[in-house]
Each structure stands twice: as structure tokens, then as C-alpha cells.
Interface confidence: low
């Protein structure tokens, strides 16, 4: 139903759910910090811009007592339960910020009447794909999608020769919520991945994927998998692999594959880490001094949620708008702001996009090193390093299906 | 506005124990993670010992099997049983809290942190262990 919103007369206000059901586990207290530090900097853009006016945030805490799970298996509901104490307490900003888990978002945008722009730090899944007034600041799965049917199909590069048409996705259950999404997306029967592959077969028992490590019957050299190096030691271990055999590990929100200290262990020789572009400045920030690497990007997408209301109300502001109109609610797509750690792109249905980048593990350093960048806004590949120096024979990717010629 | 008050910090000799208590006041968050983190002169900050608010305990291997955390709900009290101390024991002991929106997971995962991040502080209580 209509809520009437705290959005008029120079007053701004900005409604975050601060949801028990999220989709990393990050103390409450970090994703304030990180708001209110988005709130300084909106303050101070505003008031450079002669703009005098006030912009605050509410924070809507969920009572925990019903959707206590803390994953985001039991967020169905909360989302619409906080929504439902917003509207009681007659206290929606001009924007919502917070569902992260795909479950609440996608509830919410379906149950609501959404006049107001939502910005949600997760809601990885396809079902949350082509919403109108859904702003997603942390990479979707569809991104992952593209890129991995781009990589499967390049078969010009020095280091890759083969076009890839199979694939094995190894998903036990146990993912986190990012890789849930993602992984699910390229299980799905009807997706973009699953559409340009001939082959595809998920594996979901450790033993499947230990056994096809070795398989001289396997139907495919790749497998994708979520999750950290720690997560692949568990599963793989010591075990000996076909020396033709590829592991993609998809790793989106972990920099510390950029440390200057990190030496990549052993068992990483035949895997091909997917991870986002490292940020310059987060490691000194004020918000980001307590977070774990991993954590970063979640905070990172609260605060940069809050410079894009920013960014969007300098705009309608300037230009004598009104703030609480449908243009408003559907205006957050299409366009680059300044984000805390440089400019921020949001496509045509107001997702993110970045610069993804696989790495490989050099033989000689036992590094890891940039092996190509892809840009999601563009759907391009970039090659880095022309000679990788790769594990696998002539330091070529093989062939997705062992014994097959060039194609 | 949250405040953490801690007492019982002393002077005991090795093989002594002590009991830390931290009063809370102002914390309203039905989820929490709470515990003792504790800095000895010239190191960074390590946790102690955290209970999250689904009764889940964390210890750090350090102290398992001589220190037990606790809580008493309706005096809003968190306490630190510390036996058979040692020299290394030696330290400032913070209690420390913070909202959490994962039970017993990320409230473990924080004894394993360096200068974990807690977003409440106590001042701090000196324990000193020494003949």
C-alpha cells in the first residue's frame, strides 16, 4: 500500500533495513558506519552544489524474534515485515536501502507498490534480474553468466585456442548467499549459460567431484565452483587431477588474492580464480578498518547506495524536480556516479557493472597473476598476460573435452 | 546510547583465578555478540572469550578449559571466570559487543581476528598476574 514518504520541503530521508537475514554476516554496527559515512560525504556534495538542504537515515532494525535463521533462507518475510513497520510508523524515507537477500527482495518488489527507488547490496539471483525500480550495487548473477559464456567462446587468444562447449558446476548446498545465486543461475535449465552450452551437469556430493578429477570418462576438463581457496582445500585437498583438467573458482567479493605477501598454495596450480577488480582506497577508510577483505565490497555497496540517492537528488534537485515521483523511483539505472572508490556504472536496469579478472597461479612465482580483465559493461574480454606461465601443457588452456582437435 | 562497564580486574598470583564482570546498559539489539577481548603491553587486541545472543560460546585456545563466559539476562551482566591463571594471562580486558546478523557463526569467527571488530567498548580492566 501507499506510504507516505519523509521527502519534501528539504528534508530527505533515507530508509535502511537493517535486516537479521542478510546475505553476508556483517556486524550491524559496520553497515552503519558505512552509511553514515556515505551520509557525511552526500552532505558535503550538497552543500558544494548550494544546495541547503537536510539529508539523515532510518535505521528499520528487524525484532530477530520470527526470521532468526541470520542466513537468508528464512528472509521471505522479513523484508515485508520491515516494510510493514515502516508503513505503520508512517516513516518511509525516498528511498529504501537494504534487502541483500534475493528471497526479500524479490517478495518485496512483488507484494509492494513500489513507488520509491530500492537499493539492495546482494539480491544475486535472476528472479531479481529487469526490475524497474531495483538498483543492485553488488555484481548479479547474470553478469557471471555473461562473462563465463564470453570466456567459453574465445578461442583467439595466445593462451586459450579452443572454444569450450561443456562444463561440470559443482553446488553441495552449503554456499554462501552470493554463490547460491550464482551458481544456481548457471544450473538453471532456462538461463543465458545453460542455453549456449551442449553439455552441462551439476555436481552435488563431494565424492562426484572428487571422482571426476580423475575420470577418464569425464564429458568435460571444467568445472566451476564458489567459494575461497580454503573452501576448494577442503573438497579437493592433495588429490592428484588430470593434468587437462580446469577448475574455475568463482571468488567476486575476496581481494587478497592482490596482497603483496599472498603465495598461492599448491593445490591452486589448476584453477582459474574469477575475481572483481581490487578497490585503491578502502584499505585506509575509515568505515572499512574493521572489515575483513571479504566484507568490504558488502559494506562498500551500503555506502555507495547512499552516494547514488546522493548523486540522484543533487540531479532532480537542480533541475526543480520532484523527489517523490514515479521519474525518480525509475531513475537510478543507466548512468555513472561517484562512488566512495571511483566512479560507479549502473546499466540499463540499474545493475552494476566491473571489471572482473581471472588470475591463474604461476609455476615459476607461485603467484597469482593477472591473466585477462573483463568488462561487464561492454561484454569484453581484455588478454594481460600474453605468456602466462600456466601449469598446463604449453601453457595453453586444453580443451574442454579431452581428444578433441582444433576447432 | 551504549555503555560497558567492567570491574573485577586485580593483581593475582599464577594458579589464582578472578571474575570479571561488564555491566550493560542501553543495548536494545535482540541478536548480539558479546565477550572479552584483552590487549597485553606492546600486542594487538585478541578475543578472549564471546557468547552470542543464541547462547553460543567462543574461547580462544589459549584459555579453553581454565576461562568460562556467562551472562545473567535480568541484571544485563557478562562475566569472565578466569582459573588457573598464568603470567601470560597478564593484560587490559575489555568487554566489547556489537549487533550481529548471524547468530553463533560470525560471533565465533571473531575470536579467530585480530583487533576483532566490535562497534561497543568498554574502558577497560587490568589483570595482572605475577608472584
Known amino acids: 500500500s501507499q506510504v507516505s514518504q519523509n521527502c519534501h520541503n528539504g528534508s530527505y530521508e533515507i530508509s535502511v533495513l537493517m535486516m537479521g537475514n542478510s546475505a553476508f554476516a556483517e556486524p550491524l554496527k559496520n553497515l552503519e558506519d558505512a552509511v553514515n559515512e556515505g551520509l557525511e560525504i552526500v552532505r558535503g556534495r550538497l552543500q558544494n552544489a548550494g544546495l541547503n538542504v537536510t539529508v539523515n537515515a532510518t535505521f528499520m532494525y528487524s525484532d530477530g524474534l520470527i526470521h532468526n535463521s541470520g542466513d537468508c533462507r528464512s528472509s521471505t518475510c522479513e523484508g515485508l515485515d520491515l516494510l510493514r513497520k515502516i508503513s505503520n510508523a508512517q516513516r518511509m524515507g525516498c528511498v529504501l536501502i537494504g534487502p541483500s537477500c534475493t528471497y526479500s527482495t524479490f517478495q518485496m518488489y512483488l507484494d509492494t507498490e513500489l513507488s520509491y527507488p530500492m537499493i539492495s547490496a546482494g539480491s544475486f539471483g535472476l528472479s531479481c534480474d529487469y526490475k524497474e525500480t531495483l538498483t543492485r550495487l553488488m555484481s548479479p548473477a547474470r553478469k557471471l553468466m555473461y562473462f563465463l559464456v564470453n570466456f567459453w567462446k574465445t578461442n583467439d587468444l595466445p593462451f586459450k585456442t579452443y572454444s569450450w562447449s561443456t562444463s561440470y558446476v559443482y553446488k553441495n548446498g552449503t554456499e554462501t548467499e552470493d554463490c547460491f545465486w550464482y551458481l544456481n543461475a548457471l544450473e538453471a535449465s532456462v538461463s543465458y549459460f545453460s542455453h549456449e552450452l551442449g553439455f552441462k551437469v551439476v555436481l552435488r556430493q563431494d565424492k562426484e567431484f572428487q571422482d571426476i578429477l580423475m575420470d577418464h570418462n569425464r564429458k568435460s576438463n571444467v568445472i566451476i565452483m564458489c567459494g575461497g581457496p580454503e573452501f576448494l582445500y577442503k573438497l579437493k585437498g592433495d588429490r592428484a587431477v588430470a593434468e587437462d583438467i580446469v577448475i574455475i573458482l568463482v571468488d567476486l567479493f575476496n581481494d587478497q588474492y592482490f596482497e603483496d605477501n599472498v603465495t598461492a598454495p599448491d593445490y591452486m596450480k589448476n584453477v582459474l580464480v574469477l575475481t572483481l577488480s581490487p578497490g585503491n582506497s578502502l584499505l585506509n577508510s575509515s568505515f572499512s578498518r574493521n572489515l575483513s577483505p571479504t566484507k568490504r565490497d558488502f559494506a562498500l555497496a551500503y555506502l555507495n547506495g547512499i552516494l547514488l540517492f546522493g548523486h540522484m537528488l543533487k540531479i532532480f534537485l537542480e533541475n526543480g524536480e520532484n523527489i517523490t515521483t514515479p521519474k525518480f523511483a525509475h531513475a537510478f539505472r543507466n548512468l555513472t556516479f561517484e562512488g566512495y572508490d571511483g566512479p560507479v556504472t549502473l546499466d540499463d536496469w540499474g545493475d552494476v557493472d566491473s571489471t572482473m579478472v581471472l588470475l591463474y597461479t604461476s609455476v615459476d612465482t607461485k603467484k597469482y597473476k593477472v591473466l585477462l580483465t573483463y568488462d561487464t559493461h561492454v561484454n569484453k574480454t581484455y588478454p594481460v598476460d600474453m605468456s602466462p606461465t600456466f601449469t598446463w601443457k604449453n601453457s595453453k588452456l586444453p580443451n574442454d573435452i579431452t581428444g578433441r582437435g582444433p576447432q | 546510547e551504549v555503555q560497558l562497564v567492567e570491574s573485577g580486574g586485580g593483581v593475582v598470583q599464577p594458579g589464582g583465578s578472578l571474575r570479571l564482570s561488564c555491566a550493560a546498559s542501553?543495548?536494545?539489539?535482540?541478536?548480539?555478540?558479546m565477550g572479552w577481548v584483552r590487549q597485553a603491553p606492546g600486542k594487538e587486541r585478541e578475543g578472549v572469550a564471546l557468547?552470542?545472543?543464541?547462547?553460543?560460546?567462543t574461547y580462544a585456545d589459549s584459555v579453553k578449559g581454565r576461562f568460562t563466559i556467562s551472562q545473567d539476562n535480568s541484571k544485563n551482566t557478562l562475566y569472565l571466570q578466569m582459573n588457573s591463571l598464568r603470567a601470560e594471562d597478564t593484560a587490559v580486558y575489555y568487554c566489547?559487543?556489537?549487533?550481529?546478523?548471524?547468530?553463533?557463526?560470525?560471533?565465533?569467527?571473531?575470536?579467530?581476528?585480530?583487533?576483532?571488530?566490535?562497534?561497543?567498548w568498554g574502558q577497560g580492566t587490568l589483570v595482572t598476574v605475577s608472584s
Open positions: 557468547i552470542a545472543s543464541d547462547g553460543t560460546t
Open positions: 566489547a559487543a556489537d549487533a550481529v546478523n548471524w547468530y553463533g557463526s560470525i560471533c565465533a569467527s571473531m575470536i579467530r581476528r585480530k583487533n576483532p571488530a566490535f562497534g561497543y
Open positions: 542501553g543495548y536494545t539489539y535482540s541478536r548480539y555478540c
